[in-house]
């Protein structure tokens, strides 16, 4: 899978994580920080 950094317009897309652009899948993906989940890392879990 080809990946690159997300475009600058996606700054802030991932609330608690790193945004990665999955080129072949035509979508952005959030790699969440520890303790966070959700498509955009918006949920905190203990």
């Amino acid at each position: 899978v080809s990946i690159t950094k997300c475009n600058s317009d996606m700054n802030g897309y991932c609330l608690h994580g790193q945004c990665i652009y999955l080129v072949d899948m035509s979508q952005n993906y959030c790699r969440c920080e520890v303790g966070y989940t959700g498509v955009r890392c918006e949920h905190f879990y203990l």
Partner: antibody
């Protein structure tokens, strides 16, 4: 399957406002950005602005500042674009477009006609 | 705002010809360019994103290349069903469409 269903065609008088809706099904708009694009008859595509429904923040093209309002209701999974002070050159097909989780998934378009 | 200058605005070519459309950005857009095909009365159809990544179901005669500010879209062998208007879109910093290129058959 994922869908963006827009509201029906509108006819408005100059100076009036129009509010176009864009209802998502099959996915949560909070996971995406919703963009708005328009196309006047026989003309090119023009990006108007977008909303991040999760945060509620918007970005607009400078020429539309003060005239376009983009909102989202996450409880109904619907985005809205309201354009005020309509003039004849606002006659166009208005599209909502999903981006973020999937690159550019388009609604079917809404024709807005401005005529006295 | 980033400006996208697309050329030519229209072209006429024969079936089987190689067709090339260019888009020049007013600043580096880091390969974040997409190409759309639009036929009359239809919504635009995404052909290519991230400069050269073909979308599923799009024929291999369509291709894209470029970097920095200069990008190219190519139809290697024009077919009758390719008659349409083509648009570039930069999506690095917000979004800007090129002015479009109307492709006709000679």
């Amino acid at each position: 399957q994922d869908q963006l269903v827009q509201s029906g065609a509108e006819v408005k008088k100059p100076g009036a406002s129009v509010k176009v809706s864009c209802k998502a099904s099959g996915f949560n708009i909070k996971d995406t950005y919703i963009q708005w694009v328009r196309q006047a008859p026989g003309q090119g595509l023009e990006w108007m602005g977008r909303i991040d429904p999760l945060r509620g923040n918007t970005k607009r093209r400078e020429k539309f500042e003060g005239r376009v309002t983009i909102t989202a209701d996450t409880s109904t999974n619907t985005a809205y674009m309201e354009l005020s002070s309509l003039r004849s050159e606002d006659t166009a097909v208005y599209y909502c477009v999903r981006s973020g989780t999937l690159f550019d998934f388009w609604g079917q378009g809404t024709l807005v006609t401005v005529s006295s | 705002d980033i400006q996208m200058t697309q050329s030519p605005s229209s072209l006429s070519a024969s079936v089987g010809d190689r067709v090339t459309i260019t888009c020049k950005a007013s600043q580096d857009i880091h390969k974040y360019i997409a190409w759309y095909q639009q036929k009359p009365g239809q919504a635009p159809r995404l052909l290519i994103q991230y400069t050269s990544t073909l979308q599923p179901g799009v024929p291999s005669r369509f291709s894209g290349s470029g970097s920095g500010t200069d990008y190219t879209f190519t139809i290697s062998s024009l077919q009758p069903e390719d008659i349409a208007t083509y648009y570039c879109l930069q999506y690095d910093n917000l979004r800007t469409f090129g002015g479009g290129t109307k492709v006709e058959i000679k």
